[in-house]
């Protein structure tokens, strides 16, 4: 039975050219996290964190994506095209698969402040 919940940074905004942390956290379960996939709004994978193999950043994102903190992902040198949905998929044993969603809005405005808060989607 899947008892866990995914908490995410929810809806966040950040400045063009800046960076942002995409974070998901699995709670309320003792299940072992075997793999976390990070996926972009067009369903292309950005990165995978496998418990045994470690991190793999997809070549197309190597210059702009840094692993961590933790199982999260840091997106750098943001462009307007980075606006959209991001998904974390937690593969766990024995529970199965959990999914979290984050919406990132990249703002042109130089006064835009990075806003983030943990919330349950």
């Amino acid at each position: 039975m899947m008892t866990g919940t995914i908490e995410t940074t929810g809806n966040i905004s950040a400045k063009k050219g800046g960076s942002v942390i995409l974070q998901c956290h699995l709670s309320s379960t003792m299940a072992q996290v075997t793999q976390v996939n990070w996926e972009q709004h067009d369903h292309s994978l950005l990165a995978i964190r496998n418990a045994e193999l470690g991190w793999h950043i997809y070549p197309a994102f190597k210059d702009r994506v840094a692993p961590g903190p933790g199982l999260g992902l840091t997106l750098q040198s943001l462009t307007m095209n980075d606006t959209g949905e991001y998904f974390c998929t937690y593969h766990t044993y024995p529970d199965g698969t959990y999914r979290g969603r984050i919406f990132l809005e990249v703002l042109e405005s130089s006064v835009a402040e990075h806003s983030a808060r943990f919330q349950i989607p």
Epitope: N37, E39, D42, H43, I48, H56, Y58, H91, T97
Partner: antibody
């Protein structure tokens, strides 16, 4: 129980357009999946042709890009394949299959339909 | 395109034997490889994804391993119902590509 069922003509003439439909039951085609066409040639080689996602976005195999169109009818929970200018080399068993965008594997397949291109 | 080279193309074995099939990707696919079983006249069935994750309901005699470019699929003790054709598939990037298949036959 998720089920996919292909339908279409078993025979198409060379240079014509092949049309197949996949009817999905037990899963909405507007939920978090991509809906695929895969074909298997007589020699058993499998070729992924393309998909349409729950949001209607399509991705095609570049080897077919100029000839392929995948569309959907959400009211009937169906998606369709059109392949133009067919030749004998397009003779194959055509499968529709569900791909988990977040799980990234084909978990459900149709039973397949054999399509022969011949005059 | 990523080419998946599978070997052997066929093999003869007996019930109870241990069987290993290999698949080599033409470029690094991390662990993004799935394995499918297909019986004559049927559609492929998912067994393994992400190289080593057993799909729901798949018996534990089926296992997978590997990363980067080299992957292995193993049946620890072949049962009568396992005689079929097995395919590897990379799910690293589109176009998604399959190996040519390995036909497992009764010796």
């Amino acid at each position: 129980q998720v089920q996919l069922q292909e339908s279409g003509p078993g025979l198409v003439k060379p240079s014509q357009t092949l049309s197949l439909t996949c009817t999905v039951t037990g899963s909405s085609i507007t939920s978090d999946y991509a809906w695929n066409w895969i074909r298997q040639f007589p020699g058993k080689k499998l070729e992924w042709m393309g998909y349409i996602t729950y949001s209607g976005r399509t991705t095609y195999n570049p080897s077919l890009k100029s000839r392929i169109t995948i569309s959907r009818d959400t009211s009937k929970n169906q998606f369709s394949l059109k392949l133009s200018s067919v030749t004998a080399a397009d003779t194959a068993t055509y499968y529709c299959a569900r791909w988990g965008l977040l799980r990234r594997y084909f978990d459900y397949w149709g039973q397949g339909t054999l399509l022969t291109v011949s005059s | 395109d990523i080419v998946m080279t599978q070997s052997p193309s066929s093999m003869s074995t007996s019930v109870g034997d241990r069987v290993t099939i290999t698949c080599r990707a033409s470029q690094d696919v991390f662990n993004q490889v799935a394995w499918y079983q297909q019986k004559p006249g049927k559609s492929p069935k998912l067994l393994i994804y992400s190289a080593s994750f057993r799909y729901t309901g798949v018996p534990d005699r089926f296992s997978g391993s590997g990363s980067g470019t080299d992957f292995t699929f193993t049946i620890s003790s072949v049962q009568a119902e396992d005689f079929a054709t097995y395919y590897c598939q990379q799910h690293y990037s589109t176009p998604l590509t399959f190996g040519a298949g390995t036909k497992l036959e009764l010796k």
